[in-house]
Each structure stands twice: as structure tokens, then as C-alpha cells.
Amino acid sequence: EVEKTACPSGKKAREIDESLIFYKKWELEACVDAALLATQMDRVNAIPFTYEQLDVLKHKLDELYPQGYPESVIQHLGYLFLKMSPEDIRKWNVTSLETLKALLEVNKGHEMSPQVATLIDRFVKGRGQLDKDTLDTLTAFYPGYLCSLSPEELSSVPPSSIWAVRPQDLDTCDPRQLDVLYPKARLAFQNMNGSEYFVKIQSFLGGAPTEDLKALSQQNVSMDLATFMKLRTDAVLPLTVAEVQKLLGPHVEGLKAEERHRPVRDWILRQRQDDLDTLGLGLQGGIPNGYLVLDLSMQEALS
């Protein structure tokens, strides 16, 4: 806290300019009018105030706007945004995407801070949904943003926004999140032709059900092993050897290297060894010839 002292003669700030960087903290407190600061916030970011000096300026704005800053001030906070606490940000009403972009720019290249997370939360809640422009902006600054949302939060993403998603944006998503995103992606890309559709839907396939994988296997998509390994185990298990062979195309040879890992391991255990042998990959662990396979889950469903 800076002591209240009178401004020295001739030091009263007439405008926010670079001469202020040579003021001591107490001089800034005494000589800079909060209303002047608010109207000239756009200049602050161009001036190399120390973070200690920015603390003083923040204190002035806090006194002027105890209920929270207006958007006209928020938009021009620049590096002063780094001095805000999540509690400060919760008082704000940020509606403009330009304001959001301006503040995200300050933290660009760094991990998402609690301030940024709070800002995004306030912005998205204010909009009511994650529209395409917002999602575009957020994933540009934070590729992992989408995967930081809960399945419940992801349910508010409209299918049209899925067009903004890049494969790397989904790198850290877990199956529960992909379960929510996949149907949206399927809807978003439904009017694309086969090969183009597969390119777009590929990153979301970790949420695809068996019937969709079966349909893809009829379209010569040549799925790579990395994508196959991210599929839901329960969706892969019912696929036949022929379907997996068609789904993977030339990449089918990669199954051998993955035979001890899920979902390949579990899938092998469900296939007849005879069928696996047709692949010529030396996959072992299938159901021996002459054994009968009872699907107990089907039996339970019937009883």
C-alpha cells in the first residue's frame, strides 16, 4: 500500500506519458488522477511501467471502479491484466471478442493462468455458448483449450464451431470428451465426400461407435495405427478381421507391433485364430478353432 502524500510541485500528471516511468510509486499515487488514467488507458501498454508501478495504477482503477471495470477500460489493460486476480475479473462483463483477444495477447505463448481461465469462463458464460469465432480465438491462443472443458461444458459447443477445431486441439482430450465431440463433428462434416470427410473426422474418431467404424471400413480410408489406437475399445471389439483389414488398408501390418496394447490386444482375444491367420502377421491369442463363443452380454439382454 502506497502512503497518501501530496504531489510535489510541478509533477501533477497532465497526461499518461513516458515521463511517468521515472516517478516513484508514491509520486504515481499522488500525481496521477484515476479519471485521467481511465480515459487514457490505451497509452499504458505502450509505456514500460514496472509491475510495481502497474500495481499503483491498478489500485487507482480499483478505487474508481469498485464494482468492476467497464469494458472500455478492460479492452486497454494490456500488461496491467497480469496484475488482476480472478476475483477482480469475476466483477467484469466482457462481451466483445476484440477485448478477449487483446487480453489473451498479453499472455500469449505462456500457460493458461488462473486469470485467463476466469476471463474465458466469464466470456463464454456471457455468450451462452462456445460459438465458432470464440472457439477459433481460444484454440489459436491455447490449442489444448477444448480438452480442458468438461463433457457438460462441451455439450454447449454448436456443431458449426467444430470447423474451427484443428487435430492438435484434441491431443489431450480423453474418451469422455470425444464422446461428446464426435457426434457434433459427424453432423458438421456430414455433407463432405468420403476422403475429405475422413480427413476432417479422423481426429474425433476416439468417440465413434462400432457402426460408424464399420461404415468407414467400406470406404477405403486407410486409417493409420495412431488413430486406430485411440478408438474406443468397446467400439473396436465387435469389428471382424475383414473389417479391420479394410479399415486400416496398408497400415494393417502395424497391428503386430501393437498386439500387446489396447484396443488391439482385447480385439485379438475376441477373434477366431483362423481369421487372424489370414492377415499373415503372426498375431496370436485368438479363439482356437473348434471353440464356441458365447456372447453373454446378448444373453443378459434377452433374459
Epitope: I47, P48, T50, Y51, E52, Y79, L82, K83, V106, N107, G109, H110, E111, S113
Partner: nanobody, 116 residues
Framework: QVQLVESGGGVVQAGGSLTLSCAAS????????MRWYRQAPGTERDLVAV??????YYADAVKGRFTISRDNSKNTLYLQMNSLRAEDTAVYYC???????????WGQGTLVTVSS
């Protein structure tokens, strides 16, 4: 984290010149502004010069005599001091602040003594 190490201080005659260096290491990519401060015995630490992007700023007392510069390829900040006066005698400190962490970092200081 950013580490700053100053060098180049020493004893110089009034009217002479000296160049201070400040080598930065660590998370130098996140540095926002760099500054030279000085502190004479028994006084507060005063801001001498700042480099911020391509802009430079100087305290009135050193304007026209001192030049701040930065070599990004060497991660080094400089302060070229000409026409030195007895009142320039002080410990000179290098300072940097960073984006993201919004933190200030300081060097250990280097003593400049101007003898008349």
C-alpha cells in the same frame, strides 16, 4: 526464471567513459522490458534508462550522455556511459521483467566510481 549478471564497473576519471554489460539467461524469451537503475550511498534506487521493444527512455540526469542498448543474439543489455561525473558514482543494477509471471528480476549490481 531469469538470471542477470552485470559486469564492467570500475573506477574512472571524471569525463571518462565506461560500458556496463548485463548478461541474461534462463527464460529470456519472456522478457518484456529491461532497465538500468543506480543507487548512490544513502539514497533510493533510481531508474536510469529503459529499453522496451525498440524504444529507449532516459532519466533527465543522464540524457545525452548515456545510451542503453540490447543485443538479443547475445541476450545482453548494455549501458554506454560517456562524460561521467562524480554524481554518477553508484552501484548500477540491471533489471528485467517478464510476461506470463509478471515478475521482476535483478542482478547483483556493479560499482561505478567516478573520481574527480
Amino acid at each position: 526464471q531469469v538470471q542477470l549478471v552485470e559486469s564492467g564497473g570500475g573506477v574512472v576519471q571524471a569525463g571518462g567513459s565506461l560500458t556496463l554489460s548485463c548478461a541474461a539467461s534462463g527464460s529470456t524469451f519472456s522478457i518484456r522490458a529491461m532497465r538500468w537503475y543506480r543507487q548512490a550511498p544513502g539514497t533510493e534506487r533510481d531508474l536510469v534508462a529503459v529499453i522496451y521493444g525498440s524504444s529507449t527512455y532516459y532519466a533527465d540526469a543522464v540524457k545525452g550522455r548515456f545510451t542503453i542498448s540490447r543485443d538479443n543474439s547475445k541476450n545482453t543489455l548494455y549501458l554506454q556511459m560517456n562524460s561521467l561525473r562524480a554524481e554518477d558514482t553508484a552501484v548500477y543494477y540491471c533489471n528485467a521483467d517478464t510476461i506470463g509471471t509478471a515478475r521482476d528480476y535483478w542482478g547483483q549490481g556493479t560499482l561505478v566510481t567516478v573520481s574527480s
